[in-house]
């Protein structure tokens, strides 16, 4: 899996989308997890409704919410009030039994709020994201 980069501004919301084949993953719950280290486990943050038919209902864990369009095949994760500690590697997963198939690998980048003048001297204007192998950036 290639990694897709999603960039958000500190204090704002970031929406991450994970498209998938709706028939291939029919009946499967989904999850959003945070990768702990390069080879470490992916720690579950939030998962869709226990009843797959109700996957469209938004479920929340703290500032992270998840909802699944099971017919259209798009899993959407919303990170509210984005903070620097939210930056890192994540995965969208499709669950079956004790298995978790990776739908998409995600790198969340948190940009400084350009309207926040508290540290104007250190203001960094975001340019093109540093790319790594086959990275795809979405804002």
């Amino acid at each position: 899996h290639n990694t897709t980069v999603f960039q958000g501004v500190e204090g704002q919301s970031l929406q991450v989308s994970c498209p998938y084949d709706s028939m291939k993953h029919w009946g499967r719950r989904k999850a959003w997890c945070r990768q702990l280290g390069e080879k470490g486990p992916c720690q579950r943050v939030v998962s869709t409704h226990n009843l797959w038919l109700l996957s469209f209902l938004r479920r929340r864990n703290g500032s992270t919410a998840i909802t699944d369009d099971t017919l259209g095949g798009t899993l959407t994760i919303t990170l509210r009030n984005l903070q620097p500690h939210d930056a890192g590697f994540y995965q969208c997963q499709s669950l079956h039994g004790s298995e978790a198939d990776t739908l998409r690998k995600v790198l969340v980048e948190v940009l400084a709020d350009p309207l926040d003048h508290r540290d104007a001297g250190d203001l960094w204007v975001p340019g093109e994201s540093e790319s790594f192998e086959d990275a795809h950036v979405e804002h």
Epitope: K24, G27, L51, L53, H96, G97, E99
Partner: antibody, heavy 123, light 107 residues
């Protein structure tokens, strides 16, 4: 009516290659996982592996990884099981089976099966 | 791999008898279990899925129960057409292994 029709019986010599087929009809073949199951003479069922014809995502049992290749051609609704070099121990009946999908559940259960293909490997 | 162990490996019974076959998983599989019936020279037939749900068209004399590691298939009143080999299969993870089978014979 959903059907999985397998290719006919084969008699081969050790070291020969072989590709058997499983053609689906009566359902959207692309959208169902297709598994292959081995049954050696007088023995039980052994799960070999599975493929999703939509994108050819394939999973193998460790017991069969590297021994066989599972593939599919969604344009003709057909899944394949192939060997590059057969052994006498490959003599068995091979079944293909469709993974059941219900309206609310993705399962690992098999609701439709092919009739089986008998492969005999003998010198 | 999750290993599936069936018992007994064979059982003799008469028409009208109640028969129970058990299946044990080497680790917990919740209710991700199926039961199949196979007759000589034929493909297996799905009887029970999700441990206890009856597949469409399967007679009500067949029932399944269990969760975690221990499961049972029960035939409440054996009919002549029920004499066959029965297999359990776990669907929790890959590879989706089968049990070794239980042959149900006429006494």
């Amino acid at each position: 009516e959903v059907q999985l029709v397998q290719s006919g019986a084969e008699v081969k010599k050790p070291g020969e290659s072989l590709k058997i087929s499983c053609k689906g009809s009566g359902h959207s073949f692309t959208n169902y996982w297709i598994a292959w199951v081995r049954q050696m003479p007088g023995k039980g069922l052994e799960w070999m592996g599975i493929i999703y014809p939509g994108d050819s995502d394939t999973r193998y049992s460790p017991s069969f990884q590297g021994q066989v290749t599972i593939s599919a051609d969604k344009s003709i609704s057909t899944a394949y099981l192939q060997w590059s070099s057969l052994k006498a121990s490959d003599t068995a009946v091979y079944f293909c089976a469709r993974q059941r999908t219900f309206y609310y559940d993705s399962s690992g259960y098999f609701d439709y099966w092919g009739q089986g293909t008998l492969v005999t490997v003998s010198s | 791999d999750i290993q599936m162990t069936q018992s007994p490996s064979s059982v003799s019974a008469s028409v009208g008898d109640r028969v129970t076959i058990t299946c044990r998983a080497s680790q917990g599989i919740s209710n991700w279990l199926a039961w199949y019936q196979q007759k000589p020279g034929k493909a297996p037939k799905l009887l029970i899925y999700a441990a206890s749900s009856l597949q469409v068209g399967v007679p009500l004399r067949f029932s399944g129960s269990g969760s975690g590691t221990d499961f049972t298939l029960t035939i409440s009143s054996l009919q002549p057409e029920d004499f066959a080999t029965y297999y359990c299969q776990q669907a929790d993870s890959f590879p989706r292994n089968f049990g070794q089978g239980t042959k149900l014979e006429i006494k």
